[in-house]
């Protein structure tokens, strides 16, 4: 067993900077755009453009805003309640199994295949066999004949966290 080590009359923990507004938690939780103070008495606002929180929470700190990588475009900026939305640049896409980087879309389909889907920020061009109509996935073999594709139209974010 061990006894006490204590400090009396401490300065309030984690004082908010002047720009950080405070409010009281509701049932131990703080609203989106805030985090809770260490003593649980205050909700401290996230800093616009620096961090955010999307739900009612008791987080120790707001979450750091994502910075879009080179090769990505910023669809919407980080706010106190929503993370930055980044999207792969035109002509590139992000696969689910390699979300860390945007990859170049293929310029065309292998011989014997026809393009049925454009390059989008979240998918490569889609090729199917002319006869069977079955999809082709994976890397392009040595291309003998290609069907040129036009860049996809940006639609929805391929990197959305928050």
């Amino acid at each position: 067993e061990s006894a006490l080590i204590t400090q009396q009359d401490l300065a309030p923990q984690q004082r908010a900077a002047p720009q950080q507004k405070r409010s009281s938690p509701s049932e131990g939780l703080c609203p989106p755009g805030h985090h809770i103070s260490e003593d649980g008495r205050d909700c401290i606002s996230c800093k616009y453009g620096q961090d955010y929180s999307t739900h009612w929470n008791d987080l120790l700190f707001c979450l750091r805003c994502t910075r879009c990588d080179s090769g990505e475009v910023e669809l919407s900026p980080c706010t106190t309640t929503r993370n930055t939305v980044c999207q792969c640049e035109e002509g590139t896409f992000r696969e689910e199994d390699s979300p860390e980087m945007c990859r170049k879309c293929r310029t065309g389909c292998p011989r014997g295949m026809v393009k049925v889907g454009d390059c989008t920020p979240w998918s490569d061009i889609e090729c199917v066999h002319k006869e069977s109509g079955t999809k082709h996935s994976g890397e392009v073999p040595a291309v003998e004949e290609t069907v040129t594709s036009s860049p996809g139209t940006p639609a929805s974010p391929c990197s959305l966290s928050g």
Partner: antibody, heavy 116, light 110 residues
């Protein structure tokens, strides 16, 4: 008077389990983030884990993730650290402390020795 | 390689001023408050400076903290023999989503 009283340390074999307890008094326990910090013999301080006042948010050091579980019982004003799959490198004095990133009240520590 | 770096040792004579440095990165010191802890031999650590430069009550004003960019420092003026201890800087690290301590600086009063 604010205090943290620790118990539950001891000698355990590698792969074994142990539960540490930290009883708080003198402040509104359920309001505060609480943490565990450890110190291997002759070494520096290493943060282990933190938990929010309600227990809704928890944080862990990579070195203990998946093996240690922090929890609390606000009705008993007690903080716990359940340690499973213990390794020799977990040998340390374990401190409980008030706060999640500013530790203003510390327990006296309890020794955990992992050895065969 | 520690996330925060501190000199392993520092020393001074009684009455002198001593400074202990702490270097980090944008994910910790650069964006979060720095705390300093003092650990006297055989005892639990004690909060010495919080929020970069705030002294909890009971901490003598001989101790002061500062932060600039990704570095912080602790200054002790009018050094006394009872200041002989280990000093740790610490901060939350956003990349690790956890709290990090520096390796500690052993202060010897000559």
């Amino acid at each position: 008077q604010m205090q943290l009283v620790q118990s539950g340390g001891g000698l355990v074999k590698p792969g074994g389990s142990l539960r540490l307890s930290c009883a708080a008094s003198g402040f509104t326990f359920s309001d505060y983030y609480m943490s565990w910090i450890r110190q291997a013999p002759g070494k520096g301080l290493e943060w282990v884990s933190a938990i929010s006042g309600s227990g809704g948010s928890t944080y862990y050091a990579d070195s203990v993730k998946g093996r240690f579980t922090i929890s609390r019982d606000n009705s008993k004003n007690t903080l716990y650290l359940q340690m499973n799959s213990l390794r020799a490198e977990d040998t340390a004095v374990y401190y409980c402390a008030r706060g999640g990133s500013t530790f203003d009240i510390w327990g006296r520590g309890t020794m955990v020795t992992v050895s065969s | 390689q520690p996330v925060l770096t501190q000199p392993p040792s520092a020393s001074g004579t009684p009455g002198q001023r001593v400074t202990i440095s702490c270097s980090g990165s944008n994910s910790n010191i650069g964006s979060r408050p720095v705390n300093w802890y003092q650990q006297l031999p055989g005892t639990a650590p004690k909060l010495l400076i919080q929020g970069n430069n705030q002294r909890p009550s009971g901490v003598p004003d001989r101790f002061s903290g500062s932060k600039s960019g990704t570095s912080a420092s602790l200054a002790i003026s009018g050094l006394q023999s009872e200041d002989e201890a280990d000093y740790y800087c610490a901060a939350w690290d956003d990349s690790l989503t956890g709290y990090v301590f520096g390796p500690g600086t052993k202060l010897t009063v000559l």
